[in-house]
């Protein structure tokens, strides 16, 4: 039978560490981390780490009992936790029968937004006390709300992560930029900034209807290639909503005309 893993929390040092071992398995060949979205309840998601590792292909894996993975997170709240994954069988070959290295993965360790994590893994039995213990570590910075996985977190959906404003912005002439976007059902206030090194144009928009809206914004200098920053003010996130960006391009001949005055917004400036 092929070895599989059974993982569980192990907070303190592994018991094997207290025992002298004449021989120990080698280190891991590779360690990788990615994010996975798991359903917790209806419309509730948890974002977890999918940690995968590859064993080094040599006879020392015959001694391998387990692999221990520890994760420390650094943001406003420091965290540290470990799991121990026991191999269910002794390894009878250095590669999988179908070819390739022995590869295992563990899904766990909840992930916070924009946090630096250090993930380290070592094989058990590990080196004796006062000896170098071969371990593999990777740094992983979890992304923010616009990441394709993180955007489903409640914290992110409330900040507007699932809203697609589909911003388009084009330079009508030297003095005017037309910005189009789709409004958000959770709010009706927006600010639009057009920036290069400085702010070239600014507008506040009030729009109650759920629609594609168009705003003409006066600019003070050359706007082609400038960044358009759209900030929504939603009921769920107030002033802390996710900002969206677009780029000003030249308007083409066929670009949609600015709608009649009842739909046009030219506030602020």
């Amino acid at each position: 039978r092929e070895p599989t893993i059974q993982c569980g929390s192990e907070t303190g040092p592994s018991p094997e560490w207290m025992v002298q071992h004449t021989l120990t398995p080698g280190d891991l060949r590779d360690l990788q981390v990615e994010l996975v979205k798991t359903s917790v309840a209806a419309e509730e998601f948890s974002i977890l780490m999918n940690i995968s590792w590859i064993l080094r292909a040599d006879a020392s894996i015959r001694l391998l009992k387990a692999t221990k993975i520890c994760v420390s997170g650094k943001n406003n709240m420091n965290s540290y936790s470990c799991v121990r994954c026991n191999y269910t069988e002794a390894f009878q070959s250095q590669t999988r029968p179908s070819g390739g290295k022995w590869t295992f993965s563990y899904v766990g360790f909840p992930v916070e937004l924009s946090t630096l994590y250090l993930i380290s893994a070592h094989n058990i039995p590990n080196a004796n006390m006062n000896e170098d213990s071969p371990s593999l570590s990777v740094n992983f910075t979890s992304p923010g709300c616009l990441n394709h996985v993180m955007k489903y977190k409640k914290q992110c959906t409330e900040a507007g992560s699932l809203w697609d404003p589909d911003i388009t912005a084009c330079k009508k002439n030297e003095k005017m930029v037309e910005v189009n976007f789709t409004t958000n059902p959770l709010g009706n206030r927006y600010t639009i900034l057009i920036q290069r090194d400085t702010t070239l144009g600014f507008s506040r928009v009030l729009e109650n209807k759920l629609m594609r809206t168009s705003v003409a914004i006066p600019v003070t200098e050359e706007s082609e290639g400038a960044v358009v920053q759209l900030t929504p003010y939603l009921h769920t996130c107030g002033n802390d909503c996710i900002r969206r960006e677009g780029t000003v391009v030249l308007c083409s001949e066929t670009s949609a005309p600015i709608p009649p005055d009842d739909n046009r917004r030219m506030l602020g400036g």
């Epitope: 021989l23 040599d58 006879a59 020392s60 015959r62 590669t95 290295k101």
Partner: antibody, heavy 118, light 107 residues
Framework: QVQLQQPGAELVRPGASVKLSCKTS????????MNWVKQGPEQGLEWIGR????????QYNQKFKDKAILTVDKSSSAAYMQLISLTSEDSAVYYC???????????WGQGTLVTVSA | DIQMTQSPASLSVSVGETVTITCRAS??????LAWYQQKKGKSPQLLVY???NLADGVPSRFSGSGSGTQYSLKINSLQSEDFGSYYC?????????FGGGTNLEIK
């Protein structure tokens, strides 16, 4: 049955390179590491290195890391070893040998006699 | 690198005798040891792996033993086809090394 086929001999000039082949059959090529072993005239066996055909991971004996280049061609189930900057010291029989479950060498090719001579 | 020291380097014996070849590793190789036989002009053939396991088709007069750093290959009642060279090899961790060989010749 498992077979590893190697050409019988190669004659090469000093300073030149030679690429030795090891054509395999009778087993799943990507499932076992392929090793290369040198045997000098009237001498013992020296492990040169090994390659995993699955992902082309290579491990060399440090002594040969600037002498041998190991490759595989999965589509034809063949392993290759290129020997570079040849000198008379490189005149030897070179074997390919397939690993077993671990790195005992369960199957060997017939060997290629490389003669380096002007 | 792990050194494999094999002895004796050569042995002259008669058919029907029993011989033992020994191999010492410079460090513990955890029983990851193989033995090979090589006839003149031929490629080596696996005889024994994991110290005691006989490869397919190897006669039962061959047997291996040992642990840690000390290993041996015993051939009971030598047959004429057993003459040739014998090599031990460790496969604990790369780089793998062979013993210097034992040349077994007919007396």
């Amino acid at each position: 049955q498992v077979q590893l086929q190697q050409p019988g001999a190669e004659l090469v000039r000093p300073g030149a390179s030679v690429k030795l082949s090891c054509k395999t059959s009778g087993y799943t090529f990507i499932s076992y590491w392929m090793n290369w072993v040198k045997q000098g005239p009237e001498q013992g066996l020296e492990w040169i290195g090994r390659i995993d055909p699955y992902d082309s991971e290579i491990q060399y004996n440090q002594k040969f890391k600037d002498k041998a280049i190991l490759t595989v061609d999965k589509s034809s189930s063949a392993a290759y070893m290129q020997l570079i900057s040849l000198t008379s010291e490189d005149s030897a029989v070179y074997y390919c040998a397939r690993s077993g479950g671990f790195d005992w060498f369960a199957y060997w090719g017939q060997g290629t006699l490389v003669t380096v001579s002007a | 690198d792990i050194q494999m020291t094999q002895s004796p380097a050569s042995l002259s014996v008669s058919v029907g005798e029993t011989v033992t070849i020994t191999c010492r590793a410079s460090e513990n190789i955890n029983s990851n040891l193989a033995w090979y036989q090589q006839k003149k002009g031929k490629s080596p053939q696996l005889l024994v792996y994991d110290v005691t396991n006989l490869a397919d088709g190897v006669p039962s007069r061959f047997s291996g033993s040992g642990s840690g750093t000390q290993y041996s290959l015993k051939i009971n009642s030598l047959q004429s086809e057993d003459f040739g060279s014998y090599y031990c090899q460790h496969f604990w961790r790369p780089p793998y090394t062979f013993g210097g060989g034992t040349n077994l010749e007919i007396k």
